[in-house]
């Protein structure tokens, strides 16, 4: 189920690459975030908490990523026109309950100015 377009700036361009921002509520403690290109899983990151509140971060499909208390950023490099597509953040929330999944996304437009050496 697609819950809709991201209501924030999802794509941030840097030097021929793009940072894709996937947000989640800061109350969420354990989750899986997947970055989808069309229907294909490009990246994922899972945050879990063990005994003693030890945090574990795992990736089955690894991309350069950055985790904050309310977002996961995935970084794609060496942009070319083939990167233009719909990208979705697929968030599965495990804790706190209830278990829920939400999908938000947007279209990544690639312009010539973003392909190389442009700092936005």
């Amino acid at each position: 189920e697609i819950n809709g377009s991201a209501n924030y700036e999802m794509f941030i361009f840097h030097n021929g690459g793009v940072q894709i921002l996937c947000k989640y509520p800061d109350i969420v403690q354990q989750f899986k975030m997947q970055l989808l290109k069309g229907g294909q899983i490009l990246c994922d990151l899972t945050k879990t908490k063990g005994s003693g509140n030890t945090v574990s971060i795992k990736s089955l499909k690894f991309c350069h990523s950055q985790l904050s208390n309310n977002s996961v950023s995935f970084f794609l490099y060496n942009l070319d026109h083939s990167h233009a597509n719909y990208y979705f953040c697929n968030l599965s929330i495990f804790d706190p309950p209830p278990f829920k999944v939400t999908l938000t996304g947007g279209y990544l437009h690639i312009y010539e100015s973003q392909l190389c050496c442009q700092l936005k």
Epitope: N3, P25, I27, S92, F94, P96, P98, K100
Partner: antibody
Framework: QVQLVESGGGLVKPGGSLRLSCEAS????????MSWIRQAPGKGLEWVSY????????YYADSVKGRFTISRDNAKNSLYLQMNSLRVEDTAVYYC???????????????WGQGTMVTVSS | DIQMTQSPSTLSASVGDRVTITCRAS??????LAWYQQKPGKAPKLLIY???SLESGVPSRFSGSGSGTEFTLTISSLQPDDFATYYC????????FGQGTKVEIK
């Protein structure tokens, strides 16, 4: 049709125990997370306990933690609530309800049972 | 814990009226909000989930809106069958219900 039927309610003295059952039919029970919710006479709704589709994840409201135990038997399409050390304030109608499916795509609490009354009184 | 506050507690209305019930969360719950209808002696019935999605089989006169902390349930034209108590419920973090709004005949 899709339905939930609770049983096991009744009158019990403070400190006593009861076991509530909820029998599911009309859907694949093992695909769904389930909850118990209660409603004291003339009052609002209060979530009590929640169990994942496999039974591996279980949560309780603070008001019942350590006294109530939720469980399920997917082979019997049944949900249970074992209630120990009952208090007067546990008096309520207890509902079982179907929560989301294991894909997380279901709507919340879309099917409820008719409820079973638990009265705790000396 | 996330607290849910509903207003008004009681609402007197007539058949055909447009009715609005408000629910406020103590912190942002995004769109993780459901609305239920309950009649005396009966179990609650799901009307709306994810703040604005209409549950299958629920009449289109019911609608939900809002996100973050402010939500509304609207009945566009009140019908005799709609006199009941309505509850909001957040499900971002565990579950909390509002205290209920009783819609009664004016």
């Amino acid at each position: 049709q899709v339905q939930l039927v609770e049983s096991g309610g009744g009158l019990v003295k403070p400190g006593g125990s009861l076991r509530l059952s909820c029998e599911a039919s009309g859907f694949t029970f093992s695909d769904y997370y389930m909850s118990w919710i209660r409603q004291a006479p003339g009052k609002g709704l209060e979530w009590v306990s929640y169990i994942s589709s496999s039974g591996s994840a279980i949560y309780y409201a603070d008001s019942v933690k350590g006294r109530f135990t939720i469980s399920r038997d997917n082979a019997k399409n049944s949900l249970y609530l074992q209630m120990n050390s009952l208090r007067v304030e546990d008096t309520a109608v207890y509902y079982c309800a179907r929560d989301e499916d294991y894909h997380g795509s279901g709507s919340p609490r879309d099917i409820w049972g008719q409820g079973t009354m638990v009265t705790v009184s000396s | 814990d996330i607290q849910m506050t509903q207003s008004p507690s009681t609402l007197s209305a007539s058949v055909g009226d447009r009715v609005t019930i408000t629910c406020r969360a103590s912190q942002s719950i995004s769109s993780w909000l459901a609305w239920y209808q309950q009649k005396p002696g009966k179990a609650p019935k799901l009307l709306i989930y994810k703040a604005s999605s209409l549950e299958s089989g629920v009449p289109s006169r019911f609608s939900g809106s809002g996100s973050g902390t402010e939500f509304t349930l609207t009945i566009s034209s009140l019908q005799p069958d709609d006199f009941a108590t309505y509850y909001c419920q957040q499900y971002l973090s565990y579950w909390t219900f509002g205290q209920g709004t009783k819609v009664e005949i004016k």
